[in-house]
């Protein structure tokens, strides 16, 4: 899987939408987790409602909110009041028993300054770009780049 880079502004919200095959993932809960180390585990931040039929209801853990549109095949995660330390590698996951299938890898990048304070062209200069069905940013002051990151080792 490629890594999607999403940029958000400190203090604002960032919304991530991970798409998936609704039939394949029928009945499965979804989760949002943060990678803990170079090769470390992914620590669960928040997961959808325990009753799958109620997955559309928003579940919150601190400043992170998740909700799943199981018919459309889209799980949406909102990171509210972004902090610099929220930057890092995350995953959207589909849960089946104790197993977790990675739907999307996301690099969250947090910027300090309003975009008009910098040359927007300097923010992202794509070097490698690839298309895939995955996370899309839905926040007006964010940048979205779908890119292939090298291994983090």
């Amino acid at each position: 899987l490629n890594t999607t880079v999403l940029q958000g502004m400190a203090g604002q919200s960032l919304r991530v939408s991970c798409t998936y095959d609704a039939l394949k993932h029928w009945g499965r809960r979804k989760a949002w987790c943060r990678q803990l180390g170079e090769e470390g585990p992914c620590q669960r931040v928040v997961s959808t409602h325990g009753v799958w039929l109620l997955a559309f209801l928003k579940k919150r853990n601190g400043s992170t909110v998740i909700a799943d549109d199981t018919l459309a095949g889209t799980v949406t995660i909102t990171l509210k009041n972004l902090q610099a330390g929220d930057a890092g590698l995350y995953q959207c996951q589909s849960l089946r028993g104790r197993e977790a299938e990675v739907l999307q890898k996301v690099l969250v990048e947090v910027l300090e300054d309003p975009l008009d304070d910098q040359d927007a062209g300097d923010l992202w200069v794509p070097e490698e770009s690839s298309s895939f069905e995955g996370a899309q940013v839905e926040h007006s002051t964010s940048r979205n780049q779908e890119t292939s990151f090298p291994p983090t080792s």
Partner: antibody, heavy 120, light 107 residues
Framework: QVQLVQSGAEVKKPGASVKVSCKAS????????MHWVRQAPGQGLEWMGW????????NYAQKFQGRVTMTRDTSISTAYMELSRLRSDDTAVYYC?????????????WGQGTLVTVSS | EIVLTQSPATLSLSPGERATLSCRAS??????LAWYQQKPGQAPRLLIY???NRATGIPARFSGSGSGTDFTLTISSLEPEDFAVYYC?????????FGGGTKVEIK
């Protein structure tokens, strides 16, 4: 093993610019962030900003906005920090420090430091 | 910007003793706090991140705790190589800031 090797000491006059380099080895250069941190003689640490070598994207501390420029050359795995309009209080050791992709705002490996002296 | 206040400024202890260093933030930084060690003439070294996670290769005698505004770095039994200056760093809010440091010296 991860290594960050910085360029040598510099002596500059007030108003001039300085460009410090940081050559990375032992890991994939474009797979981590690079920060710059400075330390005035006998003082504490001061963060200046970061560059994402994969994209060239930067984020600078407001204090240095307009005076600092961070760039990179991925072909030689090297990051650069240029500071312009130097003043005497810019005299410091300048460090590059890696920010791992999983937690980009921590500094897990550091260069050896470059002493920049600003004096007329 | 968030101000980090470290105390004490200097800690005089003997090898084998326990060292307790404090870092207080001017506003909450959640658990987004790191600790670094710096020896004279050397670059800092990451010890702890996210308040309590030991960095790769850091001995178990180093531990961190706290959240919000009050944080502690504990060295359970000082080794000769532990005498150095220790800095805390918050990574919650831009600009990233460091404390003024605590010097751990041999008594």
């Amino acid at each position: 093993q991860v290594q960050l090797v910085q360029s040598g000491a510099e002596v500059k006059k007030p108003g001039a610019s300085v460009k410090v380099s940081c050559k990375a080895s032992g890991y994939t250069f474009t797979g981590s962030y690079m920060h710059w941190v400075r330390q005035a003689p006998g003082q504490g640490l001061e963060w200046m900003g970061w560059i994402n070598p994969n994209s060239g994207g930067t984020n600078y501390a407001q204090k240095f906005q307009g005076r600092v420029t961070m760039t990179r050359d991925t072909s030689i795995s090297t990051a650069y920090m240029e500071l312009s309009r130097l003043r005497s209080d810019d005299t410091a050791v300048y460090y590059c420090a890696r920010g791992p992709l999983y937690h980009p705002m921590i500094f897990d490996y550091w260069g050896q430091g470059t002493l920049v002296t600003v004096s007329s | 910007e968030i101000v980090l206040t470290q105390s004490p400024a200097t800690l005089s202890l003997s090898p084998g003793e326990r060292a307790t260093l404090s870092c207080r933030a001017s506003q909450s930084v959640s658990s987004y706090l790191a600790w670094y060690q710096q020896k004279p003439g050397q670059a800092p070294r990451l010890l702890i991140y996210d308040a309590s996670n030991r960095a790769t290769g850091i001995p178990a005698r180093f531990s961190g705790s706290g959240s919000g505004t009050d944080f502690t770095l504990t060295i359970s039994s000082l080794e000769p190589e532990d005498f150095a200056v220790y800095y805390c760093q918050q990574l919650s809010t831009y600009p990233l800031t460091f404390g003024g440091g605590t010097k751990v010296e041999i008594k």
